[in-house]
């Protein structure tokens, strides 16, 4: 070999200078007598080489690289040979950092694998091969005095954890543990841990289970869950405290924590939850009161809380069939009494015959908000309840009585906007307990079954805003009935539109007779349309050839009109405007010409 490189150090701190020399032997006869030595770092030629001929005839070039900023590179010593660069020798240069102090050293004792698992953070990248060794010794006291050394634990490449097997451990006795990091640029050691393996024991969590319902045990209350846990048996004799966490399966709620619980509670009633809600639950435990590590969270248990019986007030209203007064249509509306009033599965209407204690006859069971049933002849009252799997609401009595109370007066209605109507009245004397307001389409589309109704609990109210099922351009019938202690007053009704439509078109004008200075016109009125308010008046407009306009207002019952004071032999444009409270519409234009002075009248 013709050339040889030697370097001040093959491994340096990143950014440090490095000096290299390349010596070319004299016996390389195929070379120039005065060859020029070139330096290359990686693929780049490096200037600054100082070349000299030594006394033994060899050529030497020395180069100093001021900053080695590559973590790994090849430094080559070359000669120009023909058109190419001939490499005589090359060395690998490495640059990096000495190892930082390993930090966050922590250990866990796993009782199942019978080993102490220690892990650490190695610190920033050194860019150099760095070895880590977990070192430890047994100690009688608090690790100030070193006892027997324990065999070094060397992690697999790239791992930052290591297991010390049971045969090297002494339980209930302290051990000194630290990590040593080493590379070509230096050695560092983590702070020493002093621990008893049992004080870092990490247990397995208990298994959560639902409690098997026993016949004598009371079922859980609404919003409660009964659960139990099976402790992890290998840790059974270790005193522990546990904590439970739960969250609803649906929604974005975060975990709620319950604890501390003793491991041996074994069974537990968790309350204060939402009724009829599916929950996810987990448990974990820690050695306590002695030190330890929290176990992982147990696998999830999914349970549903029991629901609560409906807590609602049922507002009721009823109607008798005109042809068969014993057939009653009962309507109701649930009004929640609490924020969480319970799910309603259905409704039952029932009747208890007098003198038959305990005998209850169901009249209907439905999920709807109304039902029609035949009222037994002796029945004056029925009971309505809402129910679900947890029970029923408080029964609402419905008394079927004659209308004996006073009527309200001055019932009136007015539109608020296209989707609401205000109905007002003057309350009767004495004040009622409340009112039932019903509304639905008026004639010709009127239907008893399609009425909407509302209960106004305030007997002193003098009006109600109808906002449900109100559409513009429809005629509504509104019925208001006052309610008294054991009876009701007669119902009153009124008709109203929330918004009326302008006439869709005005009648067509027809010429009946014409003269020199007059013209008789007629038209056929449009038939009334549902949702369109009645006509209030017509206005007839006529314009002469000189663009002079004239008009006359006619009442809504008009069927014709005579234009007087026209010019003979003149052209006129005429149209009719039909108007209602909701707007007006023009007819098409009729054009006519009056007769010449010498012409005879046309009839």
């Amino acid at each position: 070999e013709c050339g040889h490189i030697s370097v001040s150090a093959p491994i340096v701190h990143l950014g440090d200078p490095i000096t290299a020399s390349c010596i070319i032997k004299q016996n390389c006869s195929h070379l120039d007598p005065e060859p020029q030595i070139l330096w290359r770092l990686g693929a780049e030629l490096q200037p600054g080489g100082r070349q000299q001929r030594l006394s033994d005839g060899t050529q030497e070039s020395i180069i100093t690289l001021p900053h080695l900023n590559h973590t790994q590179a090849f430094l080559s010593c070359c000669l120009n040979w023909g058109n190419s660069l001939q490499i005589l020798d090359q060395v690998e240069l490495r640059a990096g950092y000495p190892p930082a102090i390993p930090h966050n050293l922590s250990c866990l004792m796993n009782l199942t694998t019978s080993s102490l698992i220690c892990q650490w953070e190695p610190g920033p990248e050194t860019h150099l091969p760095t070895s880590f060794t977990l070192k430890s010794f047994k100690s009688r006291g608090n690790c100030q005095t070193q006892g027997d050394s324990i065999l070094d634990c060397v992690p697999k490449d790239g791992q930052s954890h290591c297991c010390i097997p049971r045969k090297h451990l002494l339980l209930y006795q302290n051990m000194g543990i630290w990590v040593q990091a080493e590379n070509a640029l230096g050695t560092s050691m983590s702070p020493q841990l002093c621990l008893d393996p049992m004080d870092v024991v990490k247990l397995e969590p208990p298994m959560l289970r639902t409690m098997d319902p026993s016949p004598e045990a009371a079922p859980p209350q609404a919003g409660c869950l009964q659960l139990c846990w099976e402790p992890w048996q290998p840790g059974l004799h270790i005193n522990q405290k546990c904590e439970l966490r739960h969250k609803p399966q649906r929604g974005e709620a975060s975990w709620a924590l319950v604890g501390p619980l003793p491991l041996e509670a074994l069974q537990y009633e968790l309350c204060g939850l939402l009724p009829a809600t599916a929950y996810t639950l987990q448990i974990r435990c820690i050695r306590w009161p002695l030190p330890g590590h929290w176990s992982d969270w147990s696998p999830s248990l999914e349970l549903r809380t029991t629901e609560r019986a409906p807590t609602v007030r049922l507002d009721t209203w009823w109607r008798q069939r005109q042809l068969d007064p014993r057939t009653v249509q009962l309507f109701w509306k649930p009004v929640p009494l609490e924020e969480d009033s319970g799910r309603i599965q259905g409704y039952v209407v029932s009747w208890r015959p007098s003198g038959q204690a305990g005998a209850i006859l169901p009249l209907c069971n439905t999920t709807e908000l109304s039902c029609t049933f035949h009222l037994p002849s002796e029945a004056q009252e029925v009971a309505l309840v809402a129910y679900n799997s947890a029970g029923t609401s408080r029964p609402t009595p419905v008394v079927f009585s004659e209308s004996r109370g006073p009527a309200l007066t001055r019932l009136h209605a007015m539109a608020r906007d296209p989707h609401s109507l205000w109905v007002g009245w003057e309350p009767p004397n004495p004040w009622p307990q409340g009112y039932v307001i019903e509304w639905g389409l008026g004639p010709p589309s009127a239907s008893n079954s399609n009425k909407t109704w509302r209960m106004e609990q305030n007997g002193r109210a003098t009006g109600f805003l109808l906002k449900e099922n109100i559409r513009p351009f429809q005629l509504y019938e509104i019925i208001v009935t006052p309610l008294y202690q054991d009876t009701m007053g007669p119902s009153q009704h009124v008709y109203a539109y929330s918004q009326e439509m302008a006439p869709s078109h005005a009648p067509e004008l027809h010429l009946k007779h014409i003269g020199k200075t007059w013209a008789q016109l007629e038209w056929v009125p449009e038939p009334p349309e549902l949702g369109k308010s009645p006509l209030t008046h017509y206005t007839i407009f006529w314009t002469n050839a000189q663009n002079q306009s004239f008009s006359a207002i006619l009442n809504a019952s008009s069927r014709g009109f005579v234009l007087h004071g026209l010019e003979p032999a003149s052209l006129y444009h005429i149209h009719l405007m039909a108007a209602s409270q909701a707007g007006a519409t023009n007819s098409t234009v009729l054009t006519l010409m009056t007769l010449t002075p010498e012409g005879s009248e046309l009839h």
């Epitope: 009782l111 019978s114 049971r166 290998p234 004799h237 005193n239 041996e264 509670a265 074994l266």
Partner: antibody, heavy 118, light 107 residues
């Protein structure tokens, strides 16, 4: 120094009852599981029952389940074994023992002899 | 249930001998194996817990090894006071079981 002192043994007829007590001292009784182990004459050791530190967990050997009841009074540092429906095969020396965290019997009483015979 | 089988059931040895007693579990018990010594008319005494941990006050000639199903108690140099019956016990799962015992007698 851990001391466990059993009492309550004696002669009892088959079907009869007996209550063993174990007075503990020298350690914090309420922090440890305790247990009863018996040894029939000339035989090996047989686990009878254990009780958790607060008394909430009480496993039993199948041979005594439903007849024996283990209990403790942490305020009196005392362990009990109520034995009902005694049989001849229950004849043994009954040892009270303190358990360690890994289920080892760290300390033992001197034992009390229970003889079931007609 | 985990059954414990101890062997031999008895052995004769001289002072100074190395004695080995084995205990086999019917299924894996990790390191949850304890050894006891009992002398006639006395209560048992804990020697080794968790397979290899020497109980305080127990001479270092006693040692334990093994894990899973096979365990060994070794007395490196038998002393006159070591003639007794030795029991193993598993403590990983309920119910707890003891081995049948090994009686160490003077040869």
């Amino acid at each position: 120094e851990v001391q466990l002192l059993e009492s309550g043994g004696g002669l009892v007829q088959p079907g009869g009852s007996l209550r063993l007590s174990c007075a503990a001292s020298g350690f914090t009784f309420s922090l440890y599981w305790m247990g009863w182990v018996r040894q029939a004459p000339g035989k090996g050791l047989e686990w009878v029952s254990s009780i958790s530190s607060s008394g909430g967990v009480t496993p039993y050997a199948d041979s005594v389940k439903g007849r024996f009841t283990i209990s403790r009074d942490n305020s009196k540092n005392t362990l009990y074994l109520q034995m009902n429906s005694l049989r001849a095969e229950d004849t043994a020396v009954y040892y009270c023992a303190k358990l360690g965290e890994l289920g080892q019997y760290m300390g033992w009483g001197q034992g009390t002899l229970v003889t079931v015979s007609s | 249930d985990i059954q414990m089988t101890q062997s031999p059931s008895s052995l004769s040895a001289s002072v100074g001998d190395r004695v080995t007693i084995t205990c086999r579990a019917s299924q894996g018990i990790s390191s949850y194996l304890n050894w006891y010594q009992q002398k006639p008319g006395k209560a048992p005494k804990l020697l080794i817990y968790y397979a290899s941990n020497l109980q305080n006050g127990v001479p270092s000639r006693f040692s334990g090894s093994g894990s899973g199903t096979d365990f060994t108690l070794t007395i490196s140099s038998l002393q006159p006071e070591d003639f007794a019956t030795y029991y193993c016990q598993q403590s990983m799962w309920m119910p707890i079981f003891f081995g049948g015992g090994t009686k160490v007698e003077i040869k």
